[in-house]
Interface confidence: low
């Protein structure tokens, strides 16, 4: 004769408030004859959850038809779960007896706990932009999860970060928990196109972690480099001077030309190009008239980037006697 086994496959069952919980229980033998009852807890104070023969259990239904002759499935469903339903549930086989039934064997029990998914992580970066080589902090928050055990990881462009601090609150028992983590990230000059990712893994997510992202483009300022050059060729009595503003981010930029200290209001040609790393280049051309009266011309290209202090580069224009003669000759 096969020995009766009471099989409760789930050690832990996580359910959410308002949903229906299914508690599984199967037996391996029809003998001995007698009912299977469900209890919460153990000992004399245990609570009867379901008895097919007697009592009123409006929230409990059976998965199988218990009246069928060879039924070996005694699983139940409990509807409209509330926090009051948490605890360990046991299916218990009784041997039919007289004057009363005798407890014969209990299943190992299934602990029912309230499980709640964490909210989608929200990642927030620094309030102000910072230049490369400096460290910035990003925070990641997720709320409303249970149980308390949770895993949080940080990534930058797919590479896991190690410099972060994480707190889960509250420290004691609670219906739901929150996590907050702060990661320190060193900015690189090419980080305009970089991302930081906060990844949260929790038992309720069934192996599919939640992710929150932030773009480093919101946190970085790459200051420009300036170069002012005089073009060797000239057009008539004009010399072309170029100001190249390289590798800056964000795009916000103001460029002004000064001639011998006087700001020039006239239009200048310019082009803006985007580099592969997300930074920008700006090139501005300035045409200077050459005449015999102009022995010394000092040109200044001044750039104000993203509200920062202006930076400038000067060029003392080299106008050879030959050039001046040529320009004089060209003047009608």
């Amino acid at each position: 004769e096969e020995e009766l086994q009471m099989i409760q496959p789930e050690k832990l069952l996580l359910v959410t408030v308002g949903k229906t919980a299914t508690l599984h229980c199967t037996v391996t033998s029809l003998l001995p004859v007698g009912p299977v009852l469900w209890f919460r807890g153990v000992g004399p104070g245990r609570e009867l959850i379901y008895n097919q023969k007697e009592g009123h259990f409006p929230r409990v239904t059976t998965v199988s038809d218990l009246t069928k002759r060879n039924n070996m499935d005694f699983s139940i469903r409990i509807s409209s779960i509330t926090p009051a339903d948490v605890g360990t549930y046991y299916c218990v086989k009784f041997r039919k007896g007289s004057p009363e039934n005798v407890e014969f064997k209990s299943g190992p029990g299934t602990e029912m706990a309230l499980g709640a998914k964490p909210s989608a992580p929200v990642v927030l970066g620094p309030a102000a932009r910072t230049t490369p080589e400096h460290t910035v902090s990003f925070t990641c928050e997720s709320h409303g999860f249970s149980p308390r055990d949770i895993t949080l990881k940080w990534f930058k462009n797919g590479n896991e970060l190690s410099d972060f601090q994480t707190n889960v609150d509250p420290t004691g028992q609670s219906v739901a928990y929150s996590i907050r983590s702060t990661a320190r990230v060193v900015l690189d000059p090419w980080d305009v196109r970089s991302q930081v990712i906060c990844e949260v893994a929790h038992v309720t997510l069934q192996g599919d972690p939640l992710r929150g992202t932030a773009n480093l483009s919101e946190a970085i300022r790459v200051p420009p480099t300036l170069e002012v050059t005089q073009q060797p060729m000239r057009v008539g009595n004009q010399v072309n001077v170029t100001c190249q503003v390289r590798k800056f981010y964000p795009q916000s930029l103001q460029l002004t030309w000064s001639e011998n200290g006087n700001v020039c209001q006239r239009e200048t040609a310019s082009t803006l190009t985007e580099n592969k790393d997300g930074t920008y280049n700006w090139t501005s051309w300035f045409l200077v008239n050459i005449s015999d009266q102009r022995d010394d011309v000092v040109l200044t290209c001044q750039v104000k980037h993203d509200g920062q202090l202006a930076v400038s580069k000067r060029l003392a224009l080299e106008v050879t006697v030959h050039q001046k003669d040529q320009s004089s000759d060209a003047t009608p």
Epitope: T16, A116, K117, P118, S119, A120, V122, L124, T139, E141, H143, G144, D169, V175, A176, S178, R180
Partner: nanobody, 118 residues
């Protein structure tokens, strides 16, 4: 640590008004939708109203529509519930909480008792 503190409850006659406030701390308040729920004596939690993170959109249960107004001040990390034309059936403990993307509610405050009685 996430903290929610409700205030402004009290005893009021039918037809009267109350304004509840919920001060939030320990999380980035402006990034989260917020909600008010209530629990009447001997009953389960009942949803009352939601407000989006930016404050632009609000939602109300049919039982309070036209009488209650939810609002928020992200600068003060506070959400409010203005309750007008109160009825005895509005008697309950009122709780505020944050909402995640799926609409799941996370509370944590002690609640504010509102009693409507003549």
């Amino acid at each position: 640590q996430v903290q929610l503190q409700e205030s402004g409850g009290g005893l009021v006659q039918p037809g009267g008004s109350l304004r509840l406030a919920c001060a939030a701390s320990g999380f980035t308040f402006s990034s989260y939708d917020m909600s008010w729920v209530r629990q009447a004596p001997g009953k389960g939690l009942e949803w009352v109203s939601d407000i989006k993170s930016g404050g632009g959109r609000t939602y109300y249960a049919d039982s309070v529509k036209g009488r209650f107004t939810i609002s928020r001040d992200n600068a003060k990390n506070t959400v409010y519930l203005q309750m007008n034309s109160l009825k005895p059936e509005d008697t309950a403990v009122y709780y505020c909480g944050s909402l995640d993307n799926s609409g799941a509610y996370t509370g944590g405050g002690q609640g504010s008792q509102v009693t409507v009685s003549s």
